[in-house]
């Protein structure tokens, strides 16, 4: 049986059940290389409390559909008096990056995971030439996830004192220049994740090979190498390589630009101080507030919730968007869709789509950006579920009793962007984490 998601095959992936202190290793095409789980384990569970290992999915006992992968085992489990077998179930959804498997829940018999990934899309529009896993768990099993830094088109400019060269990078995947209208970036070779431009020439100085690594809990490392043979004439016989070290800052701060810290014989060392390198619980909440010692800040957007069936309305040319954030009030136009953001076509108001659901909510504060994300909306033709990204800005003089109002700023590939100026986005900082 052919591997259902070949682009995910090259790596062993990790997921964590934080509540029970369990680490899962997952290899969807072969077996994980963990002796304690046996030679054919595709999903290996490591219980850190009891220091035991169990195979909860066998690579030989795999069944797959386009959106579901199940690994059975021969181990019996007793659930409500019936004789079941232990199994793992991975539900796949279309995403814009390779993404990460997320542990959902476990019963006595079934371990459930969900994975939003380009590999599950109906169309190839989000697929990279080359992409590597862009997250890691530290020794305390806390997740560090750089997926939000991945650019689907374009690149980041590395801060470098050399006026004659420009070094462009992407994070965990190659640079897509197809949308570029003709700048220096356009000359970058396909597949490169680190592109050096000198004059009118562009050179591949690194492609992603291995996934993100953790060196300390506040430092993550990504390495790019130039795969193809043939040395560049300005590298003194050395093969180019790029090392990007992502550093979690010691206290809350605005984002910084990636900086070139060392350069020798086409070996480039880059340091990027960014809160995305911090563990995810420091940056994110499933509710509409971020507070407490863990987050170093106090943010509470719950006063923005609308009651009594009213919604915020944002005009988007062809569409009207109805928003009801930080609550579970149904938007009348999007009846029964559990939508936090509802898209209605102006020319045909019967065309209604959920652009993100209220139970699929993430509040993120990172690098000075406060963002509320609603995902899991109605599918687009690519298979990607519509989502909305609301960028909040502090405005102590916002109208509407300080609440302000959301402004639609655009759509890219079924992701809808809004900005929202409100006094409730004014962040109160605590001290060190």
């Amino acid at each position: 049986q052919a591997a259902p998601f070949p682009e995910l095959c090259s790596y062993t992936w990790e997921a964590v059940d934080t509540k029970n202190n369990v680490l899962y290793k997952i290899n969807i095409c072969g077996s994980v290389d963990i002796v304690q789980c046996g030679p054919s384990s595709a999903v290996c569970m490591h219980d850190l409390k009891t220091r035991t290992y169990h195979s909860v999915g066998d690579s030989v006992l795999r069944s797959a559909t386009r959106s579901l992968l199940e690994f059975n085992t021969t181990v019996s489990c007793d659930q409500q008096g019936t004789n079941h077998r232990v199994q793992s179930s991975i539900a796949f959804l279309c995403g814009k990056t390779l993404g990460t498997p997320e542990f959902v829940t476990a019963t006595e018999c079934v371990h459930y995971f969900e994975w939003r990934t380009t590999a599950a899309c109906k169309k190839d529009i989000f697929k990279a030439n080359k992409e590597v896993p862009c997250y890691v768990f530290d020794e305390e099993l806390r997740k560090h996830d750089l997926n939000p830094l991945i650019k689907l088109s374009g690149a980041y400019l590395v801060d470098d004192s050399d006026p004659d060269t420009s070094l462009f990078i992407n994070v965990c995947r190659d640079i897509d220049t197809l949308r570029d209208p003709g700048s220096q970036l356009r000359a970058c070779p396909p597949g490169t994740a680190a592109c050096l431009v000198r004059g009118h020439q562009a050179f591949d100085v690194g492609q992603p090979r291995d996934g993100l690594k953790v060196v300390r809990k506040d430092r993550l490392v990504l390495s790019y190498v130039r795969e193809e043979a043939g040395k560049l004439d300005f590298c003194d016989g050395h093969s180019p390589a790029v090392t990007i070290t992502f550093v979690c800052p010691s206290e809350r701060r605005e984002g910084t630009i990636p900086k070139l810290t060392a350069k020798s014989n086409c070996r480039y060392e880059i340091e990027w101080i960014t809160e995305y390198a911090c563990h995810r619980d420091y940056l994110e909440s499933k509710t509409c507030s971020l507070s407490g010692e863990q987050q170093d800040v106090s943010i509470d957007l719950t006063p923005l919730a609308q009651s009594g069936g009213s919604s915020y309305i944002s005009d988007g040319k062809e569409y009207l968007f109805y928003l009801n954030v930080c609550g579970e009030t149904e938007i009348q136009f999007c009846n029964k869709k559990q939508a936090a953001v509802c898209q209605v076509k102006k020319s045909d108001t019967s065309q209604v789509k959920a652009a993100g659901r209220y139970h699929n909510q993430t509040l993120r504060y990172s690098d000075g950006d406060l963002t509320l994300i609603y995902f899991g909306g109605d599918e687009c033709s690519s298979g990607f579920q519509r989502m909305s990204v609301i960028n909040f800005r502090c405005n102590k003089t916002a109208g509407n009793d300080g609440k302000g109002t959301p402004v639609f700023t655009g759509e890219v590939d079924c992701t809808y962007f809004f900005t929202w100026d409100t006094e409730y986005a004014c962040v109160h900082h605590h001290h060190h984490h």
Epitope: K151, S153, G154, A155, Y156, L157, D159, S166, F168, T177, R179, D180, P181, G182, S183, Q184, L185, R186, I257, P258, D369, T371, V389, N391, R393, T409, G410, E411, V412, F417, T419
Partner: nanobody, 123 residues
């Protein structure tokens, strides 16, 4: 390819104000970072201000901080540069440009350019 068309330039006295507009058409407005640049006679093109498309974060050249404001109206596919407290040294042709590179103020990283609009500040 994005097509850009600037307007709003003109002759103004020192201390006065102007608002430049740049209308974009063609390929998706939303995937770009937008910048304003200027070029005075006999000088190189220099960065004035930029706005990131995803978060609307802005950056400015030191020489215009506190006087100029970049903004955008996505409904109209238009970028603006509000220029207050103008000085004679602000005299230049002002260009609007689009880039898919983050964190850049380098004109060579901007691939689409308008034709420019002349701003003259008299003393």
């Amino acid at each position: 390819q994005v097509q850009l068309q600037e307007s709003g330039g003109g002759l103004v006295q020192a201390g006065g104000s102007l608002r430049l507009s740049c209308e974009a058409s063609g390929r998706t407005f939303n995937t770009y970072n937008w910048g304003w640049f200027r070029q005075a006679p006999g000088k190189e093109r220099e960065f004035v201000a930029a706005i990131r498309w995803s978060s609307s974060k802005t950056s400015y050249a030191d020489s215009v901080k506190g006087r100029f404001t970049i903004s955008r109206d996505n409904a109209k596919n238009t970028i603006y540069l509000q220029m207050n407290s103008l000085k004679p040294e602000d005299t230049a042709v002002y260009y609007c440009a689009a880039s898919i590179v983050d964190f850049t103020t380098n004109p060579s990283h901007f691939g689409s350019w308008g034709q420019g609009t002349q701003v003259t500040v008299s003393s």
